[in-house]
């Protein structure tokens, strides 16, 4: 079931999925000057059986000016390398992607793909947060968020993470003010809705990371 909202916003933090649950969709978006090939896939879809998950369909971009030229899907080595530098570093990764049943790894880039990826998560997806460069983490609990479904409505759990500037006088974790979910859904609206937030990963946050070459949107 698709998550119909977005992981919470934590100031000065960004998040990433380390693996993608079966059912996750990735938009086949092309960079400026390129478009999806005619009859090309709209999405890549994480599918699988009990033993193996992989991305169905391949995204293919062609020059908007050219009619028949189909660009290769296989990334050039330098493109692959460039893209990898933007991913969160391995110490952040709590599980080995390959060992997580029912999940797909990060799909490799395709030639002339857009500068940001738009994912559509499903219920049960987990994302992990880390502070952007220049900020450090104060934890009161897991720095992760999970998409859950309650009474047919989807919501993301609130990660227990505060990012503080290195120059600031830091509080002890126990002394922090509770982190409110911005634009949260008021629980009074209906008894079975739990507070959540509608958030798209902020490109300005990602842009503060020195290594950031592309951003990812999660829908």
């Amino acid at each position: 079931e698709l998550c119909d909202d977005d992981p919470p916003e934590i100031p000065h933090a960004t998040f990433k999925a380390m693996a993608y649950k079966e059912g996750t969709m990735l938009n086949c978006e092309c960079k400026r000057g390129f478009r999806r090939i005619k009859s090309g896939s709209l999405y890549m879809l994480c599918t699988g059986n009990s033993s193996h998950s992989s991305w169905d369909n391949q995204c293919q971009c062609t020059s908007s000016a050219t009619r028949n030229t189909t660009k290769q899907v296989t990334p050039q080595p330098e493109e692959q390398k460039e893209r990898k530098t933007t991913e969160m570093q391995s110490p952040m990764q709590p599980v080995d992607q390959a060992s997580l049943p029912g999940h797909c790894r990060e799909p490799p880039p395709w030639e002339n793909e857009a500068t940001e990826r738009i994912y559509h998560f499903v219920v049960g997806q987990m994302v992990y947060y880390q502070c952007v460069q220049g900020y450090r983490a104060l934890h009161r609990g897991p720095a992760e968020s999970v998409c859950k479904m309650t009474h047919g409505k989807t919501r993301w759990t609130q990660p227990q993470l505060i990012c503080t500037g290195e120059m600031e006088t830091s509080q002890f974790p126990g002394e922090e003010k509770p982190q409110a979910s911005p634009e949260g859904r008021p629980e009074s609206e209906t008894s079975c809705l739990v507070t959540t937030t509608d958030f798209q990963i902020q490109t300005e946050m990602a842009a503060t990371m020195e290594t950031s070459i592309f951003t990812t949107e999660y829908q």
Epitope: E1, D5, G23, K153, T154, E183, R185, D198, F199, Q200
Partner: antibody
Framework: QVQLVQSGAEVKKPGSSVKVSCKAS????????MHWVRQAPGQGLEWIGY????????EYNQKFKDKATITADESTNTAYMELSSLRSEDTAVYYC?????????WGQGTLVTVSS | DIQMTQSPSTLSASVGDRVTITCSAS?????MHWYQQKPGKAPKLLIY???NLASGVPARFSGSGSGTEFTLTISSLQPDDFATYYC?????????FGQGTKVEVK
């Protein structure tokens, strides 16, 4: 209480455009996606797409990609859907529906009639 | 796209009858949702996540199924139940609905 109130019925000429509005109240507008659904006369329901009001991100059913443009105005808690290059087959009732999972609240519908 | 096929398209029944509507998805989905629509009105959420009744929905309605085959059952049809029923999947984009089943008076 949650309410979605849509603009009134429209009669349009082929080739023209129409903009349908959906004013939300009773909840935090930016916290839920707003979806749009079409129902042609005597037909079933077809999902057109959604908007995330906070950032303006849209996702469309490919069938309506060149037909519908969904926008939102946070200041007035209103979502809009513009239909362009109208043809007789665009005659339908258009509904907005609050997202966040199943569609628990719907607008009353806006009938758009395309006739020469 | 996931196609949703409802059967029957029209169902003639009487008050007190047990009514069953089926919905088949062209691919496996996680859940099915059901809406009820009356003429000139917007659809109303009836059942969510396959078997859960929406707020205010009478217990005579029930839903079941998994994978590609799902069922909506009305145990004892009441006058207020004559309407059109739609199944709906939101497991993958584009979101899709069944073509509808009209429950009419026999």
């Amino acid at each position: 209480q949650v309410q979605l109130v849509q603009s009134g019925a429209e009669v349009k000429k082929p080739g023209s455009s129409v903009k349908v509005s959906c004013k939300a109240s009773g909840y935090t507008f930016t916290s839920y996606r707003m979806h749009w659904v079409r129902q042609a006369p005597g037909q079933g329901l077809e999902w057109i797409g959604y908007i995330r009001p906070k950032r303006g991100y849209t996702e469309y059913n490919q069938k309506f990609k060149d037909k519908a443009t969904i926008t939102a105005d946070e200041s007035t808690n209103t979502a809009y859907m513009e239909l362009s290059s109208l043809r007789s087959e665009d005659t339908a009732v258009y509904y907005c529906a609050r997202g966040g999972g199943v569609f628990d609240y719907w607008g009353q519908g806006t009938l758009v009639t395309v006739s020469s | 796209d996931i196609q949703m096929t409802q059967s029957p398209s029209t169902l003639s029944a009487s008050v007190g009858d047990r009514v069953t509507i089926t919905c088949s998805a062209s691919s496996s989905i996680s859940y099915m949702h059901w809406y009820q629509q009356k003429p000139g009105k917007a659809p109303k959420l009836l059942i969510y996540t396959t078997s859960n009744l929406a707020s205010g929905v009478p217990a005579r309605f029930s839903g079941s199924g998994s994978g590609t085959e799902f069922t909506l059952t009305i145990s004892s049809l009441q006058p207020d139940d004559f309407a059109t029923y739609y199944c709906h999947q939101r497991s993958t984009y584009p979101l899709t609905f069944g073509q509808g089943t009209k429950v009419e008076v026999k």
